[in-house]
């Protein structure tokens, strides 16, 4: 779909003639008709094909033609076509006399016809204008024309449409040869497809409008490349959804059981050693001067007792220092200036000469220690107490105060995690290397099956004759809620028809 | 009113020549086009061509090209259609026509001219 | 060259009754969504006169009883209520190519 347009610009008759040589009076009062048709090697006779136009009268004689397409006039004269322009054209123009208002054929004097033209060619669609001129023996006449497309027709033959858009349907406006330009932010053959935000993942996240991300379920994050782990995963990350990999140190299905209590925590004090030994459980290793279970306790040094033979101890800001009781020397009262001949052995020990009698060694009784048997054994010295038990002396045996999840006579053995059947509502406990796992009966869920879920009962349509179930969450069952007509538990029996029992 | 008034019955022998005119009156003579159309005795009818009277453009049947020529004298609004090399099958009545460009078709007709070609 | 054939030869029809006539082209007439197609009544002892352009457009002083349609190749002229002074030979015509060529004519008489 198309226009022809035509431009006339100069008319000239100077002697104010008809086409028959007769002159006009006063003159010659001139209109045009046009004619476009399809192209003829010979112009003939026959229908404008491409459409005919008339003008009012525009001047007299001669007369430059005012351009009045500003002002919604005739100039230049449209000729619409509603096909494909076929680029080649013939076109006939007359000049007319009118001496009166009325234009119409038969309205005018038998010899009116002024001058006439025929012109054949070819002619592409475009913006620029052809000028021409045409002579005949007493006029002449100077136009120009030119094809262009009608809005929303594009290419060569005005046979492209396109409709520039932005909506649902497309987001485009259209090139010079018919073709979609998808405006900022939207591709694909319409333009409805929009550019997501630069980064977005490809599989993992899309948009609705330009420079959106939107995630699928299980993934998050502006460019939605992020995976989202499972619900409840403690310390522990994902590489797709829904996954729990748990943390260094950490265990259990939502990676919450800590198998790294000493990282974590720093239970020991005082720059004590840490040991790991299972869940949550861990040994501290005493430095020199302190005691208890993480350490914490700050022994004097004298309470070791270091000095030996009845020395008695003095403590020091750096140290401490043992007074030796007479026959005795050294830093810790270990050597002595005594012999068997002077009775050191204490507590029923028995007395030995060494180096020809220079020095001698007590053989000490049960429950008796230290050079001269001076000492009473105190059991708990070499902290036999595992997993951090609290060593304790009983008259001449020693027994372990063990930690929760402790037992045996060294606190060595682990209690059964599922000993104290910490799973709820029936469910199953797993014991596992780092803690336990609880398998939840149908209804149950949670890490101790402590939360009901409610099993819709009604999910396999139990109820007949298009009755309404409604599940009782209290006892997981359903109820049938019968419509008018029908009876039984899943409204099965018509009322009146009584149900046939197989006894 | 509008009038194409034609010359009057022609018999020709073989071999000759026949010049037939066609005066129009009542409307602008150059602006139309001028047809001759040919009827055999109790036949149908054969277009033979036409001439444009304003720029003299002529357009002939294959048939009748080589023997028909048309000319016009616009001075005088008369158009002229010449048939030479006259055979018996040429006895014929012979129309003009007025057409136009703004196709109403062959509204106005002569009333014909008869032409006899007999030895 | 368009060969134009019309049917029926001739058609004898009562006063006041329909009369059809046929018109068939060897190729289409159309052009620009514009039929070359005319009618033409002729009487006898004068020349044929217009009654139908375009297929279907009436010419001037034509009476409302004839009617033309078609496009394409095929073609039909109508007298819808046949009169006396309608008795006449009647010619199809095409003039999309040179040369014009018309129907072999159909002669309409009263029954």
């Known amino acids: 779909s198309g226009v022809f347009q035509l431009q006339l610009q100069e008319f000239i008759n100077e002697r104010g003639v008809l086409a028959s040589g007769r002159p006009c009076e006063p003159g010659c009062r001139t209109f045009f008709r046009v004619c476009l048709k399809h192209f003829q090697a010979v112009v003939s006779p026959g229908p404008c094909t491409f459409g005919t136009v008339s003008t009012p009268v525009l001047g007299t004689n001669s007369f430059a033609v005012r351009d009045d397409s500003s002002g919604g006039g005739r100039n230049p004269l449209q000729l619409p076509f509603n096909f494909t322009w076929p680029g080649t054209f013939s076109l006939i123009i007359e000049a007319w006399h009118a001496p009166g208002d009325d234009l119409r054929p038969e309205a005018l004097p038998p010899d009116a016809l002024i001058s006439k033209i025929a012109i054949q060619g070819s002619l592409a669609v475009g913006q620029n204008w052809l000028l021409d001129e045409q002579t005949s023996t007493l006029t002449r006449l100077r136009y120009s024309y030119r094809v262009i497309c009608s809005d929303n027709y594009y290419g060569d033959n005005c046979s492209r449409l396109c409709k520039k858009r932005n909506d649902h349907f497309g987001h485009y406006v259209c090139q010079p040869d018919g073709n979609l330009s998808c405006l900022p932010g939207w591709t694909g053959e319409y333009c409805q497809q929009p550019i997501c935000l630069s980064g977005c993942h490809e599989q993992n996240g899309y948009c609705s409008k330009p420079a959106e991300c939107l995630c699928r379920p299980g993934w998050q994050g502006r460019l939605c490349n992020e995976c989202i782990p499972h619900n409840g995963c403690r310390h522990g990350t994902c590489s797709t959804p829904w996954q729990c990999t748990c943390d260094e140190g950490w265990g259990g299905l939502f990676c919450d059981q800590d198998l790294n209590y000493c990282t974590h925590h720093s239970p020991c004090k005082n720059g004590a050693t840490c040991s790991n030994s299972g869940q949550r459980s861990y040994t501290c290793t005493c430095r020199p001067g302190y005691t208890g279970v993480d350490c914490e306790l700050e022994l004097s040094e004298c309470d070791s007792n270091p000095c030996r033979n009845g020395g008695s101890c003095k403590d020091q800001e750096d140290g401490y220092h043992c007074l030796c009781p007479p026959g005795y020397y050294g830093l810790h009262c270990e050597h002595s200036t005594l012999s068997c001949a002077d009775s050191p052995c204490f507590n029923g020990g028995s007395c030995r000469e060494r180096n020809q009698g220079a020095n001698y060694a007590c053989e000490c009784p049960p429950n008796f220690t230290g050079s001269n048997c001076e000492k009473k054994v105190d059991r708990c010295t070499s902290n036999p107490c595992a997993n951090g038990g609290q060593c304790l002396n009983r008259g001449p045996s020693r027994m372990c105060r063990c930690r929760p999840g402790f037992t045996g006579t060294y606190c060595e053995l682990h209690v059964s995690d599922c000993a104290r059947n910490p799973c709820a509502h029936g469910g199953t406990c797993h014991d596992l290397e780092n803690g336990l796992m609880c398998t939840c009966p149908a209804g149950f869920s949670g890490r101790r099956c402590e939360v009901r879920t409610s099993i819709d009962a009604c999910a396999s349509s139990p109820c007949f004759n298009r009755a309404t179930c409604y599940t009782d969450l209290s006892t997981d069952t359903f109820v049938c809620n019968c419509p008018y007509g029908f009876v039984g538990s899943r409204c099965e029996f018509p009322v009146g028809l009584p149900p046939s029992f197989p006894w | 009113q509008v009038q194409l008034v034609q010359s009057g019955a022609e018999v020709k022998k073989p071999g000759a020549s026949v010049k037939i005119s066609c005066k129009a009156s009542?409307?602008?003579?150059?602006?139309?086009?001028i047809h001759w159309v040919k009827q055999a005795p109790g036949q149908g009818l054969e277009w033979i061509g036409y001439i444009s009277n304003y720029n003299r453009a002529t357009n002939y049947n294959q048939k009748f090209k080589g023997r028909v020529t048309f000319t016009t004298d616009t001075s005088t609004s008369t158009a002229y259609m010449e048939l030479r090399s006259l055979r018996s099958d040429d006895t014929a009545v012979y129309y003009c026509?007025?057409?136009?460009?703004?196709?109403?078709?062959?509204?106005?007709w002569g009333q014909g001219t008869l032409v006899t070609v007999s030895s | 060259d368009i060969v134009m054939t019309q049917s029926p030869d001739s058609l004898a029809v009562s006063l006041g009754e329909r009369a059809t006539i046929s018109c068939r082209a060897s190729?289409?007439?159309?052009?620009?969504?514009?039929?070359?197609m005319k009618w033409f009544q002729q009487k006898p002892g004068q020349p044929p006169k217009l009654l139908i352009y375009a297929a279907s457009n009436q010419g001037s002083g034509v009476p409302d009883r004839f009617s033309g349609s078609g496009s394409g190749t095929d073609f039909t002229l109508t007298i819808s209520s046949l009169q006396a002074e309608d008795v006449a030979v009647y010619y199809c015509?095409?003039?999309?190519?040179?040369?014009?060529?018309f129907g072999g004519g159909t002669k309409v008489e009263i029954k």
């Open positions: 015509q095409q003039s999309k190519e040179v040369p014009w060529t």
């Open positions: 009542g409307y602008s003579f150059t602006a139309y086009y």
């Open positions: 190729e289409s007439v159309d052009n620009y969504g514009i039929s070359f």
């Open positions: 026509a007025r057409d136009y460009d703004y196709d109403v078709g062959m509204d106005y």
